[in-house]
């Protein structure tokens, strides 16, 4: 058959939960301390909460059924009677009472024809302000008749026909009734919630609703123009040209900021936005949802997208509606012909209308922002240059911040890219130019996106002119080739000598993408003398082992994830892992990761890595003396030719360093 509507699916779930109590029993969740009842969906059933409030489960007859004394559950279908009597069956006795008062309406309800009545519950009538009720019952009850006719449709309409966003023609002057049927199974009629649906009558159907509904006459734009509290909003809408949309056809939700909401914003910020058509349009669009959303539809947190593109978390806490967790909605469900308005007393400024400073204020990068400000770079973060700010997280500076000197200023200038970027468009190998004149490289890994040694730690915040990238560490631009890095650090003097004697200098000086696991002098000294002599006594062997320390792509620590198998220039793979923020290669910890070079990255290690081929038994273990001598004679020529390499001047440097 046809797909079930969300309402029917929720009803089905409630029936399922109630079936152990007998046939046609539905589980109902009642919010403690109120009379609000809901058929229950799966999520609510397990959370036992509606709008953050605890609920109790009760078991009632499903719509259209009744109990039979002495029998389990609700085995009997309700007897069909006319609409008037069915009002009594569903508990809408006040509607019956007011129907009687109109004199004309009861005969219609009892007579031939086919109607739908959206009948307000007794509580709905009782909650009407006294003056409204008075005006309905005065004027020879004509207002009451009109009000009741507005709750009626001249044909039978069941819930499976109530589609989201549809309008029904009422029996009062053919005025429209707005229907919304939400994915969570809630159905609203002019934002009044359907409590008990599909109660059949001989001449139609009754749906019980939780409010008395009234005709909708104004569109959203007209409401903005009428209400004094929207004076600032009115001016902003006019300036942005959005009034055409807000008076046109469609179904929108306007989260309408009151004058008070605008007053909470610093005048400098407000004037900047109001004076910038694009920022203003984004600001207003961030208050408009693409469909009508009645307050009654919200029973738990819900992510909704604004016309501007930002996602808002709409939720509820008891009777209060919340946006992004804050109860800022002061008046809800003001109906318009083209949607619904909720008054809000805080402005929802989207990122797209903010400066870099404003973006950063809501991110965990305040320490970095203070540094930029102290370094005299503040004008870049509040101006209209197209920039991307690479701002390290506050946690990066937990051990203190650097003094603001020329070096720090330059470093900070290299955290500002001369273009407004979006991380989703960055690609591996891309270069980005900084205000400091450096070219930074982009590295794309399976689970991270890095710029040099620093990786993006949070979603971009794209502002009006600048984008904020929150980074996981201070970015260090490369200062030279891998060879320059090694030569410039006296911890690597033995490695440099070894690289030179192995003929790898040119490789590590030319353009390329290398990850070098660089053993310190201590690492060489820590080798057993035999292994050190094997390594340094044979140029070919030395080159082989050194190549095993060089990966054939750039792998910064942020790109490792849990485990990466990195192919070395020697051919075997290196197992690089990250655990508890410590990088390891072949299970040995890296002493200092991420020293960036123009052609790669250097990770400092305190041990010399041994390729798999170097780990098996030695010749001496298996060969007898005579066999060894034969082997040596056979390889005498190759050794003789290598001797000149072994005695190369570079070894003289090593000699001094290796001396015990």
């Amino acid at each position: 058959g046809p797909a079930k509507s969300p309402y029917q699916l929720v009803l089905q779930h409630s029936r399922l939960r109630g079936r152990q109590h007998g046939p046609n029993v539905c589980a109902v969740q009642k919010v403690i301390g109120t009379n609000r009842k809901y058929f229950t969906n799966c999520k609510q059933w397990y959370q036992r909460k509606i709008c953050g409030k605890s609920t109790v489960i009760s078991y009632e007859c499903c719509p259209g059924y009744e109990k039979v004394p002495g029998e389990k559950g609700c085995p009997a279908a309700l007897p069909l009677s006319n609409l008037y009597e069915t009002l009594g069956v569903v508990g809408s006795t006040t509607t019956q009472l007011y129907t009687d008062r109109t004199e004309k309406l009861r005969p219609e309800m009892e007579g031939p024809g086919s109607f739908t009545i959206f009948a307000p519950s007794n509580e709905a009538w009782a909650s009407l302000p006294a003056e409204v009720l008075d005006s309905l019952v005065s004027n020879v009850n004509i207002e009451l008749l009109n009000a009741l006719r507005y709750h009626m449709v001249g044909r039978r309409v069941l819930t499976d026909e109530l589609k989201h966003g549809m309008t029904l023609t009422s029996m009062y002057q053919n005025s429209n009734i707005q229907i919304h049927h939400y994915p969570n199974g809630i159905v609203t009629v002019n934002c009044a919630r359907l409590l008990k649906a599909d109660h059949h009558a001989t001449n139609g159907v009754v749906h019980l609703i939780d409010k008395v509904i009234s005709t909708i006459t104004n569109n959203i734009q007209q409401i903005i123009e009428i209400e004094d509290t929207f004076e600032t909003l009115r001016a902003a809408v006019a300036a942005s040209g959005l009034n055409t949309m807000l008076e046109g056809n469609g179904q929108y939700t306007l989260l309408a900021p009151t004058n008070e909401a605008f007053e909470k914003i610093p005048s400098e910020t407000l004037n900047r936005i109001l004076g910038d058509p694009e920022a203003l349009r984004d600001l207003l669009n961030n208050h408009i949802l693409k469909s009508a959303m009645c307050a009654e539809a919200i029973v738990a947190g819900l992510s909704v997208e604004t016309l501007e593109g930002t996602t808002l978390e709409v939720g509820c806490s008891g009777d209060m509606l919340t946006i992004n967790g804050k109860a800022i909605i002061s008046n809800k469900d003001i109906l318009a012909t083209n949607g619904v308005i909720h008054y809000i007393d805080e402005l929802l400024i989207p990122d797209s209308a903010k400066t870099l400073f404003e973006l950063a204020a809501e991110s965990d990068v305040s320490t970095a922002i203070d540094l930029f400000r102290q370094a005299g770079l503040g004008n870049h973060l509040s101006g209209s240059e197209r920039l991307t700010l690479l701002a390290p997280l506050n946690s990066v500076f937990k051990d203190g911040t650097p003094p603001i000197d020329a070096h720090t200023r330059n470093l900070l200038r290299n955290h500002i890219i001369k273009d407004q970027l979006a991380s989703k468009y960055l690609y591996h190998g891309q270069t980005l130019e900084t205000l400091g004149g450096k070219k930074l490289r982009v590295f794309v890994y399976r689970n991270s996106l890095c710029i040099e040694n620093s990786c993006i730690a949070a979603h971009d915040k794209r502002g009006r002119y600048g984008t904020l990238f929150t980074m996981d560490r201070v970015l260090t631009p490369p200062m030279g080739t891998v060879m320059d890095v090694l030569k410039g650090d006296n911890r690597f003097s033995m490695l440099v000598a070894a690289i030179q004697s192995a003929g790898l200098t040119e490789t590590l000086n030319r353009e390329g993408v290398y990850t070098v696991f660089a053993p310190t002098n201590e690492a060489f000294r820590a080798l057993p003398p035999r292994e050190r002599s094997r390594l340094l006594g044979d140029a070919k062997e030395l080159a082989n082992i050194l190549k095993y320390h060089i990966g054939d792509e750039i792998l910064v620590s942020g790109g490792i994830g849990a485990l990466v198998r990195l192919k070395s220039l020697q051919g075997d793979k290196l197992e690089v892992s990250l655990k508890n923020n410590v990088v390891s290669v072949n299970k040995e910890p890296v002493a200092e990761p991420d020293i960036m070079a123009t052609n790669g990255v250097v990770h400092v290690i305190t041990n010399v890595l041994q390729p798999p081929a170097n780990r098996p038994q030695e010749r001496g273990d298996e060969l007898a003396d005579s066999a060894l001598e034969i082997f040596k004679q056979a390889s005498a020529f190759s050794r003789a030719s290598q001797r000149s390499v072994r005695l190369a001047p570079v070894y003289q440097k090593l000699l001094e360093r290796m001396k015990h």
């Epitope: 057993p528 003398p529 035999r530 292994e531 050190r532 002599s533 094997r534 340094l536 006594g537 041994q610 170097n614 780990r615 098996p616 030695e618 010749r619 001496g620 273990d621 060894l628 040596k632 005498a636 050794r639 001797r643 072994r646 005695l647 070894y651 003289q652 090593l654 000699l655 290796m658 001396k659 015990h660």
Partner: antibody, heavy 120, light 113 residues
């Protein structure tokens, strides 16, 4: 077969010098690490110095560093130990020792030793 | 420096009996990259230079009788002579070649009971 013959030992006054030599035969001298090891009268063994096959890498015990110099002459198949500023505690039998192979290793072949006595 | 300690200092064993001596190093001699122990055993008979018996803690030098065997790993090592012969009377030294300076144990003197 492998032969290592030490010479140059003798009696010397404290502060004096001696040069020990070791003549190697029966193997390709330039393919092996070589060592000097000593043994004081009635005592255990003590490593003194190491020189690599090409003569590039040299290591000394702290007790002789700055006073002794190990060297080799592959053309003459000879190993040397120049001992200066000799002390009474340098009195020992000095053994010339060949390593297992062209890499630094254990002490595979030993000479008969030459005695050095430092006494006034 | 790595300190090598041998025990016992002297040992008297009957001919044909098993002789066992121990050597303990102040730090591990096991190199994780190749899983080898950098330890050798030497025999020195009176008036003679020492002679290599065992290297890599357990590999017998060619020409050494198979009654000699080495075992152990890390810091604790053992030299065993399965059936003592008269010509085995000597002082036995262990030596580490894991770190400079290379160091020897003080020796274990083996005699016939």
């Amino acid at each position: 077969q492998v032969q290592l013959v030490e010479s140059g030992g003798g009696l010397v006054k404290p502060g004096g010098s001696l040069r020990l030599s070791c003549a190697a035969s029966g193997f390709t001298f330039s393919d092996y690490y070589m060592y000097w090891i000593r043994q004081a009268p009635g005592k255990g063994l003590e490593w003194v110095a190491t020189i690599s096959d090409g003569g590039i890498y040299i290591y000394y015990a702290d007790s002789v560093k700055g006073r002794f110099t190990i060297s080799r002459d592959s053309a003459k198949n000879s190993l040397y130990l120049q001992m200066n500023s000799l002390r009474a505690e340098d009195t020992a039998v000095y053994y010339c020792v060949r390593g297992w192979d062209r890499y630094d290793s254990w002490f595979a072949c030993w000479g008969q030793g030459t005695t050095v006595t430092v006494s006034s | 420096d790595i300190v090598m300690t041998q025990s016992p200092d002297s040992l008297a064993v009957s001919l044909g009996e098993r002789a066992t001596m121990n050597c303990k190093s102040s730090q591990s001699l096991l190199y994780s990259s190749n899983q080898k122990n950098y330890l050798a055993w030497y025999q020195q008979k009176p008036g003679q230079p020492p002679k290599l018996l065992i290297y890599w803690a357990s590999t017998r030098e060619s020409g050494v009788p198979d009654r000699f065997s080495g075992s152990g790993s890390g810091t604790d090592f053992t030299l065993t002579i399965s059936s003592l012969q008269a010509e085995d009377v000597a002082v036995y030294y262990c030596q580490q070649y894991y770190r400079y300076p290379y160091t020897f144990g003080q020796g274990t003197k083996l005699e016939i009971k």
